[in-house]
């Protein structure tokens, strides 16, 4: 395990086993532990939380967090203003939306203020890292007699999203599902009406804003056929 | 089912070295801190260390550094705890704690084991 | 190092009866950071109660705990016949990890 020390202007200090090397390995102290990782998510760009687990430390232990951007103008060191806690100490940090500069490398440093040498810094693309919210207002439209339109909103920049369409019958066991990309639209060209559909959605940060592998929740499930699809035929858009 | 498994009692004379094993079974070994707890004949309980089996990293209480050693091996999920240097007031129960994931009490313990040092 | 002393050394009680077990820290102690054992001879100890108040699973709900700071307390509100045992409290907020003496309840 070899350890990339950061500093802010971007020099680099590599060190193996944080700090390990003049240390005999039958008299590990607590001070050359390695640090929880940090996990970072940006939620719909509208704040970031940063978090470990701080109960991999062998004692409770409020570490703290300090942030800065590689190689831009937004480089100096910026403590957390706002942490997180369980268990009565800190276990991440929540940046908010001025904080957050999408389309820099994020540097991250988590420290044990009790043993200062003791850090352990990560960088992120944090475009990589955007889960939005779920999709809203789902709406289905009848487009002929056995043609859906399934429609959905985002609170985001709809061009960088792509989204997962599950749905199913009261008949099947499992759901099927579609990929749909930034159009935020979906058609069901064979629909039987002696059936009952559930739809749902989830959104995605990817491909063209950012690589993010984290889907957002579920939407509300929407509901068409059999017992509902008499009321209005041609528009349907209960949430469940 | 979850339980930490210990060695037999053992007869040492004073100078000499134990070493006690703790098995772990039905429990991800590597995830859980494991603490090294004594009680002497009649006493309270006394904390002397702990051991993070994923890495190997140690920290032991000051009145035991220099004389004891934690070790484990993760292929037969198992932590050791070696004193040396015995003298007749480390005759006790060694007993081997699991720390909880979540917080840092010790949700498991293992049955205890009887050193009995005596000449 | 945090020392924990706990009291009375010994209660003699009656099944049936209530129990108060006290424990009282040279420092304060997060409540989050306390915990209670019970051990009954030839036996380990077992955990009763962690973060001062929360029993740990499959513990009677006759067993409570209380307290915060300095004072924590440990009450079995009915004693049944298996709850003659030693009790101990532990601080695990900060190292080293310390144990109370015990308080010994037997049955009177």
């Known amino acids: 395990l070899n350890t990339t020390i950061l500093t802010p202007n971007g020099n680099e200090d590599t060190t193996a086993d944080f700090f390990l090397t003049t240390m005999p390995t039958d008299s590990l102290s607590v001070s050359t532990l390695p640090l929880p990782e940090v996990q970072c998510f940006v939620f719909n760009v509208e704040y970031m939380n940063c978090t470990w687990n701080s109960s991999s430390e062998p004692q409770p232990t409020n570490l703290t967090l300090h942030y800065w951007y590689k190689n831009s103008d937004n480089d100096k060191v910026q403590k957390c203003s706002h942490y997180l806690f369980s268990e009565e100490i800190t276990s991440g940090c929540q940046l908010q939306k001025k904080e957050i500069h999408l389309y820099q490398t994020f540097v991250v440093q988590l420290q044990d203020p009790r043993e200062p040498r003791r850090q352990a810094t990560q960088m992120l693309k944090l475009q990589n890292l955007v889960i939005p919210w779920a999709p809203e207002n789902l709406t289905l439209h009848k487009l002929s007699e056995s043609q859906l339109e399934l429609n959905w909103n985002n609170r985001f920049l709809n061009h960088c999203l792509e989204h997962l369409v599950q749905y199913r019958t009261d008949w099947d066991h499992s759901w099927t599902e579609q990929s749909v990309d930034y159009r935020h639209k979906f058609s069901l060209p064979s629909v039987d009406g002696q059936k009952r559909y559930t739809f749902r959605v989830r959104s995605r940060f990817n491909p063209l804003c950012g690589s993010a592998q984290h889907w957002s929740e579920w939407s509300h499930p929407i509901h068409w056929g059999s017992n509902t699809s008499k009321e209005n035929p041609f528009l349907f858009a209960l949430e469940a | 089912q979850v339980q930490l498994v210990q060695s037999g009692a053992e007869v040492k004379k004073p100078g000499a070295s134990v070493k006690v094993s703790c098995k772990a079974s039905?429990?991800?070994?590597?995830?859980?801190?494991m603490h090294w707890v004594r009680q002497a004949p009649g006493q309270g309980l006394e904390w002397m260390g702990w051991?993070?089996?994923?890495?190997?990293?140690?920290n032991y209480a000051k009145r035991f550094q220099g004389r004891v050693t934690m070790t484990r091996d993760t292929s037969i999920t198992t932590a050791y705890m070696e004193l040396i240097r015995l003298r007749s007031d480390d005759t006790a129960v060694y007993y081997c704690?699991?720390?909880?994931?979540?917080?840092?009490?010790?949700?498991?313990w293992g049955r205890g084991t009887l050193v009995t040092v005596s000449s | 190092e945090i020392v924990l002393t706990q009291s009375p050394g010994t209660l003699s009680l009656s099944p049936g009866e209530r129990a108060t077990l006290s424990c009282r820290a040279s420092?304060?102690?997060?409540?989050?950071?306390l915990a209670w054992y019970q051990q009954k001879p030839g036996q380990a100890p077992r955990l009763l109660i962690y973060?001062?108040?929360s029993r740990a699973t499959g513990i009677p709900d006759r067993f409570s705990g209380s307290g915060s700071g300095t004072d924590f307390t440990l009450t079995i509100s009915r004693l049944e016949p298996e709850d003659f045992a030693v009790y101990y409290c532990?601080?695990?907020?900060?190292?080293?990890?310390?144990f109370g003496q015990g308080t010994k309840v037997e049955i009177k």
């Open positions: 704690a699991r720390r909880s994931g979540r917080s840092w009490y010790f949700d498991l």
């Open positions: 039905g429990y991800t070994f590597t995830g859980h801190y």
């Open positions: 051991i993070y089996p994923h890495s190997g990293h140690t």
């Open positions: 420092q304060s102690v997060s409540s989050s950071y």
């Open positions: 973060g001062a108040s």
């Open positions: 532990q601080q695990y907020g900060s190292s080293p990890w310390t």
